[in-house]
């Protein structure tokens, strides 16, 4: 069965010897009792450490209390509370405890004192030239002005490089947008409609303010 | 607007003492640790230490351990005193701000680890 | 504690142009990596933070990346008013339990 010095009885760092009714409690200097537990220690020995505001106590059985300082706990402020245990760091950061204070370090993609900025939603992101941050699954990109492509809008796009004019028509970049003069047969912003030859065409009725033809802005 | 003002440089002997003073206005002391820099003519900045404001915590390079103190002298300013000066601790010395966060909840500060405001710096000159 | 070292010492490019500024640190710092820009006269101003965050108030023609042990500042569309020293800086912690800043050596940028 269970020895009597099992789970170590002796408190205030007593060590525990077993006799043969039961077992007897060795304890350390300033401490008295069955189980240590009755400390003969004032103020006035300075028995807290790591800075801890020793203050007398209010009854015979605890001679002295020991309020303890940021980062440290036990009855005598002796052990380190490890702070980065309760993963105050966000997002996979590295919890570093300076003692008086504590500092993430951030995973790639996030920022902040607790690691808590995503760098990849547009709360961090900056597009140049007039871009704006789109977001969607999980990721952002930015949506740039005319002129301008790449991941942050900063170098300079021919908006005619992607051959937007459909049906062999010819493609000029304009300063509102880009405008596409159709091969004969063909009419649209993209020259994308062709017309019929009773003169229809298969053009949907145009948006307020747009005629067929007109750079789209 | 914030700000920070250093003072107390000037010319100084070798083996001499000097204390200078860093004054802060226009934003909240706490939740900042104020440091000091310094730069010698022509080199990068050097770190020497610094004070968190909140529990008055003092930290320096391993180098400036022993000559250079920092002290929080009240509750907008601090200071740097220095001990046995020689001719190589002549330099422009920098007052600087490295904000702290605090959250609801949290079990602590969390520091930023860099300087997001500097003061103007005040020139150390020793020479006999 | 950390060691910071700064390429080129020195760097030269045309008004509208680019330069690029390469930090390398002795250890893994993940992501804590400052920027400073430094005209005479004047002390170091903070650029960015957390190796790609600008600061309130510099123009996005002012970029950080990297992560680890190497870091970049790449300005672009360089005006005359971008010509001064960029200095990086992280901060240390060693096993020891102390707690510290260091910067690099810096970069001065010419422009033409």
């Known amino acids: 069965g269970p020895g009597p010095c099992d789970g170590n009885p002796c408190a205030n760092g007593g060590s525990c010897s077993e006799t043969p009714r039961s077992f007897e409690c060795t304890c350390p200097r300033g401490f008295y009792g069955l189980r240590c537990e009755v400390s003969g220690v004032t103020c006035a020995d300075g028995p807290c450490f790591n800075g801890g505001l020793c203050v007398g106590g209010a009854d015979p059985d605890s001679a002295y209390i020991c309020h303890c300082p940021p980062g440290f706990q036990g009855s005598n402020c002796e052990k380190r509370v490890d702070r980065c245990s309760l993963q105050p760091c966000r997002n996979g950061g590295l919890c570093l405890d300076l003692g008086h204070a504590l500092r993430c370090r951030c995973r790639a993609g996030f920022a902040g004192p607790r690691c808590e900025h995503d760098l990849d939603d547009c709360a961090g992101r900056a597009c140049a030239n007039g871009g704006t941050c789109v977001e969607g699954g999980g990721a952002h990109r930015c949506s740039c002005a005319l002129g301008f492509g790449g991941r942050d809008c900063r170098e300079r796009a021919d908006p005619c490089a992607a051959r937007p004019c459909a049906h062999g028509g010819r493609c000029y970049a304009h300063f509102s947008g880009l405008v596409c003069a159709c091969a004969p047969g063909y009419m649209g912003a993209r020259c994308e409609f062709p017309v019929h030859p009773d003169g229809a065409s298969a053009l949907p009725a145009a948006p307020p303010g747009l005629r067929p033809g007109d750079p789209q802005r | 607007q914030e700000q920070l003002v250093e003072s107390g440089g000037g010319l100084v002997q070798p083996g001499a003492s000097l204390t200078l003073t860093c004054k802060a206005s226009g934003f909240d002391f706490t939740s900042n640790a104020m440091c000091w820099v310094r730069q010698a003519p022509g080199k990068g900045p050097e770190w020497i230490a610094c004070i968190y404001n909140d529990d008055g915590s003092a930290y320096s390079a391993s180098w400036a351990k022993g000559r250079f103190t920092v002290s929080k002298t009240s509750s907008t300013a601090v200071t740097l005193q220095v001990t046995g000066l020689t001719a190589a601790d002549t330099a422009t010395y920098f007052c600087?701000?490295?904000?702290?966060?605090?959250?609801?909840?949290?079990?602590?500060?969390?520091?930023?680890?860099?300087?997001?405001?500097w003061g103007p710096g005040t020139l150390v000159t020793v020479s006999s | 504690d950390i060691v910071m070292t700064q390429t080129p010492a020195s760097v030269e490019a045309a008004v509208g142009g680019t330069v690029t500024i390469k930090c390398q640190a002795s250890e893994n710092i993940y992501n804590s990596l400052a920027w400073y820009q430094q005209k005479p006269g004047q002390p170091p101003k903070l650029l960015m933070h957390d190796a790609s965050v600008l600061t309130s108030g510099v123009p996005s023609r002012f970029s950080g990346s990297g992560y680890g042990t190497e870091f970049t500042l790449t300005i672009s569309d360089l005006e005359c008013a971008d010509a001064a020293t960029y200095y990086c800086q992280s901060d240390y912690y060693s096993t020891g339990g102390s707690y510290g800043f260091a910067f690099g050596g810096g970069t001065e940028v010419v422009v033409k």
């Open positions: 600087a701000r490295s904000p702290y966060y605090t959250y609801g909840g949290a079990p602590s500060a969390y520091a930023s680890g860099y300087f997001n405001l």
